[in-house]
C-alpha cells in the first residue's frame, strides 16, 4: 500500500532521519534569508489580515506592490506554534518543533512588512491555497514574485485542519488582548481519508471564495477591522483591485482546492494547479469547470492515478494546459526548498535535481504568461508564452507519466491505492 495517494507528503513522515541531520541542517540554513526576491519591477509589501476573528472568518497573508522598499523584511514563520504544528505533521516529537524554531525562527522573506500599498493602479488579484501541512506563509517565493509583477496575492490560511497550525480568537475580548486559540493538523485514519479529504477541499474552496469576497468588500470601501493589530491601513485597498481579473492558484492540496473553487465560483477567471494532489476531489467537479486551467507538475511527485484525474478535467472544448518541470520534486513549489543547503535539501526531498531558483522561476513565468492570456492583462508576460507549451530545456510538455491502460484500472479501483 502506498500512502502517497492519500497523503502527498507521506515520504516526509519518517522521524528516524530527523535527529541525524539536525546539526547539518543548522549549518545549512541558520538565520539566513534564502527565499528569492521577486523578478518584477514592483517593490513588494506584506501584511496579514484576519476578519472576522473567529475560526469561521478569513485569515490570509497579503503580498502586494508597495510604495517603498525600506521596511523590515517579513518574518517567514511568525509564531512558535507553527513549528510545533510542523513537528506534529512530520510525525516527530514536539521538541523537534523547538529545533525547527531554532533553525528557522529568525528567517525572513524579502517583502516589506506593512509597507504602504503602491497607489494609482488597479491590480489583478490572485487567491493562493496552501498544501497539506503548510500554512499561509510558506509560499512567499510565489506570492512575492507575483506581487513584484503587479498582482495582489491573498495567501489563505485554511481552517479545515489541513494546515500544520492556524489560530483564531474565541471572542472579541480574546482578539483584543491577542489570546490566540490554536488549531493543529488533523491526522486521519485510512478509512476516513476519502470522506474527510473531500469535506476539507469543499471547506477550502469556500474559504477561497470568502477571502475573495472580503477583499472585494474592502475594495468597495467596506470598513473592515483587522483582528490583528497591525500598522497597515486596510482602507488603502479601496479601489485597488481590478475586479474582472481574478485567479486562484494552489499547491498540492491547494491544487485540488483550485479545481474545487473554479467549479463553485465563476468570479475566478482562471486557475493554476501546482503539482495538484487530486485525491480529495469528488467526481462531480470535473465537468463543471468552464475556466481555463493550467497544471504545472513536478517530475518526481506525480503518478498515473493522479494524472488520470487531472485529465478528467480536460474536455476538447475547454482550455487546459499541462507542463512538467524536469528534475523537480513536490516541495520545489514551497519555500522550504530555499531553506536548506543542497545536500540536506536532496536528502529531505525539499530539492530536486534542478536548481530551486530555476524551478520556481519557470513555474512563476509560465504562470504569469497564463494569467496574462486569460485575465486579459496588458503586460509583457506573453514573452513566456512558450513555457505554457512546455517549450524549454527544463520543461516537459504535458507529463512524464505514462497513463496508458490506467483508465480501466482506475475505474475498478477504490481510489486509494497508487499504481506503479
Amino acid at each position: 500500500f502506498d500512502w502517497q495517494y492519500i497523503n502527498p507528503v507521506a515520504h516526509m513522515k519518517s522521524s528516524a532521519w530527523v535527529n541525524k541531520i539536525q546539526v547539518l541542517m543548522a549549518a545549512a540554513s541558520f538565520g539566513q534569508t534564502k527565499i528569492p526576491r521577486g523578478n518584477g519591477p514592483y517593490s513588494v509589501g506584506c501584511t496579514d489580515l484576519m476578519f472576522d476573528h473567529t475560526n469561521k472568518g478569513t485569515f490570509l497573508r497579503l503580498y502586494y506592490p508597495s510604495q517603498d522598499n525600506d521596511r523590515l523584511d517579513t518574518l517567514w514563520i511568525p509564531n512558535k506554534e507553527y513549528f510545533w504544528g510542523l513537528s506534529k505533521f512530520l510525525g516527530t516529537h514536539w521538541l523537534m518543533g523547538n529545533i525547527l524554531r531554532l533553525l528557522f525562527g529568525s528567517m525572513t522573506t524579502p517583502a516589506n512588512w506593512n509597507s504602504p500599498l503602491r497607489p494609482g493602479e488597479k491590480y489583478p488579484l490572485v487567491v493562493f491555497s496552501h498544501g497539506l501541512g503548510a500554512f499561509r506563509t510558506l509560499y512567499s517565493a510565489i506570492g512575492i514574485d507575483l506581487a513584484s509583477h503587479g498582482f495582489i496575492v491573498a495567501a489563505v490560511e485554511h481552517r479545515d485542519r489541513s494546515a500544520s497550525a492556524t489560530y483564531y480568537f474565541k471572542d472579541q475580548s480574546a482578539a483584543e488582548i491577542g489570546d490566540k486559540s490554536w488549531l493543529y493538523l488533523r491526522t486521519l485514519k485510512q478509512e476516513e481519508e476519502t470522506h474527510i479529504r473531500n469535506e476539507q477541499v469543499r471547506q477550502r474552496a469556500k474559504e477561497c471564495s470568502q477571502a475573495l469576497s472580503l477583499i472585494l468588500d474592502i475594495d468597495h470601501g467596506k470598513p473592515v477591522k483587522n483582528a490583528l493589530d497591525l500598522k497597515f491601513d486596510m482602507e488603502q485597498l479601496k479601489d485597488s483591485i481590478d475586479r474582472e481579473k481574478i485567479a486562484v492558484i494552489g499547491h498540492s492540496f491547494g491544487g485540488a482546492t483550485v479545481i474545487q473553487t473554479l467549479s463553485e465560483d465563476q468570479r475566478f477567471r482562471c486557475g493554476i494547479a501546482l503539482d495538484a494532489w487530486m485525491f480529495p476531489l469528488g467526481d462531480e467537479v470535473y465537468s463543471r469547470i468552464p475556466q481555463p486551467l493550467f497544471f504545472i507538475n513536478s517530475e518526481y511527485f506525480q503518478y498515473p492515478a493522479n494524472i488520470i484525474k487531472m485529465k478528467k478535467c480536460y474536455s476538447p472544448d475547454k482550455e487546459r494546459k499541462m507542463i512538467t518541470i524536469r528534475g523537480s520534486v513536490h516541495q520545489n513549489f514551497a519555500d522550504f526548498t530555499f531553506a536548506t543547503g543542497k545536500i540536506i535539501g536532496h536528502m529531505l526531498k525539499l530539492k530536486g535535481d534542478i536548481d530551486s531558483n530555476v524551478a520556481i522561476d519557470l513555474s512563476n513565468k509560465a504562470s504569469l504568461a497564463f494569467l496574462q492570456k486569460h485575465l486579459g492583462l496588458h503586460k509583457d508576460f506573453d514573452q513566456w508564452d512558450c513555457l505554457i507549451e512546455g517549450d524549454d530545456e527544463n520543461l516537459i510538455p504535458g507529463t512524464n507519466i505514462n497513463t496508458t491502460n490506467q483508465h480501466i484500472m482506475l475505474q475498478n479501483s477504490s481510489g486509494i491505492e497508487k499504481y506503479n
Epitope: Q266, P292, C313, Y314, S315, P316
Partner: antibody, heavy 116, light 112 residues
Amino acid sequence: QVKLEESGPELVKPGASMQISCKASGYSFTVYTMNWVKQSHGKNLEWVGLINPFNGDTTYNQKFKGKATLTVDKSSSTAYMDLLSLTSDDSAVYYCVRFWEGIDFWGQGTTLTVSS
Amino acid sequence: DIVMTQTPLTLSVTIGQPASISCKSSQSLLYINGKTYLNWLLQRPGQSPKRLIYLVSKLDSGVPDRFTGSGSGTDFTLKISRVEAEDLGIYYCVQGTHFPFTFGSGTKLEIK
C-alpha cells in the same frame, strides 16, 4: 429542461450581414460551450465554431473564419452568430448546439435564405 | 480535418428487423482524458438532429435500449436490435475530439 430557442427565418440580400440568436434556458449557460452548425440542402452538416460563454473564448472552423463571428450575452443567456458578406452559398439552416460529452442538445434551427 | 466515413448511404429495413450503421474516422478519436467523443444523431424528417448516443456507447436519456453503440479508436458501429417506425430518418456520426468537429455524410434509414 434544456431549451435552445433560435431566432426566426431570414430572407436577406447578397452582400448583407445578419445575426442569428440562440436563447438558452434550463441549465447553467456559462458552464457549457455553445457550438454552431450549418446544414445545407437538408443533409450536409458542417461545424462552424464554438464559444465558451464563461469568457467569450472562440474556436472557429478555418472554413468559416471571416464569415462567422460568435458572441454571447451572459446576462440574457443568449448566444449570437453574425454572418458577414452573405452569398447564396450561405443559404442553409443554422443550429446552435450545446457541447456536453460531445455535440449534445440542438436548437430548432434558423433558416437563412440569401436571394436578390 | 478528420474525415468521418459513414456506410451505408441508405438502409432499407423491415420493421422488427435489426439494422447496423458503420462509421470510420481518419484518425483515432481517443482524447487525452481517455474519452472518445464519438456521438450518433438522428434527424427525423422536418426536425432538428437529436443525439442518441454519446462517448461511443452511452445512451442519452429517453433513448430506447434497442439502440447500442460500440467501437473504439477509428471504427464505430450503431446497431438497432429491432427497427420501429419511429426510427426512420437520417443517422449521423459526429466526432468532437479534434477541431474542427466533423460529421459523417449520413445514413438514411427507410422502412421497407
